[in-house]
């Protein structure tokens, strides 16, 4: 999240790849309209919120890390888009350490937003248990906040 400038960044990213949605009727890669972007954000929001709430209940007292910044919005395109390629590695990294079922659903949605052939970086989770928990919490909080700001921007007038 944490590109507070211009929450609509996420807005059109969804112009993108929908491998999971069968059929030649699909718009080609990169080409989903804001309406479909919004649909996918609506699917992601409860997954992200639920995952965060469950983690906070399970891991009470864990602080947010000030060393982790999830750059979930790009600034290099107009309109800006969700930087799925930057977010996915984090979710792949925390998958073994969190609710795999929900993480898989989030990854599935993020994959739909991803531009084809965009490289993903490798992310390593901190080895220290406490730092690891703090890292996971931070990712979940920042991603949830990112989705909220983007959704607000999608609802605040013309896209």
């Amino acid at each position: 999240m944490l590109s507070h400038t211009g929450p609509s960044r996420f807005a059109l990213f969804l112009l993108c790849s929908m491998e999971t949605l069968l059929s030649s009727h699909m718009a080609p890669t990169h080409q989903l309209p804001p309406s479909d972007v919004r649909k996918i954000i609506l699917e992601l929001q409860p997954l992200s919120r639920g995952l965060l709430e469950d983690y906070q209940k399970k891991e009470t007292g864990v602080p947010e890390s000030n060393r982790t910044l999830l750059l979930c919005l790009t600034s290099d395109s107009q309109p800006p888009r969700l930087n799925s390629s930057a977010i996915l590695p984090y979710f792949r990294a925390i998958r073994p350490l969190s609710d795999k079922n929900i993480i898989d659903k989030i990854i599935e949605q993020l994959d739909k937003l991803k531009f084809q052939h965009e490289p993903e970086t490798e992310i390593s989770v901190p080895a220290d248990t406490f730092e690891c928990k703090s890292f996971i919490l931070t990712i979940l909080q920042q991603f949830s906040a990112c989705l909220e700001s983007v959704f607000k921007s999608l609802n605040s007038g013309p896209q």
Epitope: A27, L32, S35, K39, K112
Partner: antibody, heavy 118, light 111 residues
Framework: EVQLVESGPSLVKPGGSLRLTCSVT????????WNWIRKFPGNKLEYMGY???????DYNPSLKSRITISRDTSKNQYYLQLNSVTTEDTATYYC????????????WGQGTLVTVSS | DIVMTQSPASLSVSLGQRATISCRAS??????????MHWYQQKPGQSPKLLIY???NLESGIPARFGGSGSGTDFTLTIDPVQADDVATYYC?????????FGGGTKLEIK
Amino acid sequence: EVQLVESGPSLVKPGGSLRLTCSVTGDSITSGYWNWIRKFPGNKLEYMGYISYSGITDYNPSLKSRITISRDTSKNQYYLQLNSVTTEDTATYYCARYGNYGYAMDYWGQGTLVTVSS
Amino acid sequence: DIVMTQSPASLSVSLGQRATISCRASESVDTYGNSFMHWYQQKPGQSPKLLIYRASNLESGIPARFGGSGSGTDFTLTIDPVQADDVATYYCQQSYEDPWTFGGGTKLEIK
């Protein structure tokens, strides 16, 4: 072959609630997006909202305070409820499938005429 | 909301001639070269039937006499040659932005 069939009361009193059912065969409502659209007597079409494969709903802001779309996956049916109806809600109501992102509504029900009158 | 303006409201065409229906959106419905504009045919007593999706793609099973063109804000549905079976009301619809919106319809009659 995908088929959608609307059913429900054809007459509703002003101030009451309209509840329609869309029964789907040939596809599962746990994939794709399932929509309601209505056509007014003057032939104007209005998009009302959808329920998604996961149960997420989204509504036309013009109806948001009055509309609820729900579903029963065991029956492969989804529903439209419209509250506080007036004569302005008299229309033919259609259910329709939006199967793929970036596509269009490819299967529609035959429509059911609902008249709001006392 | 994106306002869709269709013209003409009604059209009378001789059998075998060309029918042209226009649809104008109040703002562009294009994204990365794709136009999220669709055309439907509704015959009396029937439900709408998808003819053209994304401006120019012919839906499966629809005769090649139907064609769609346009981009941005201006779109056209062409039927050439018109047959008796084409008597219907034709609607354009945008799925670019929520809420989805429709044109007012064009009623096609045979001269």
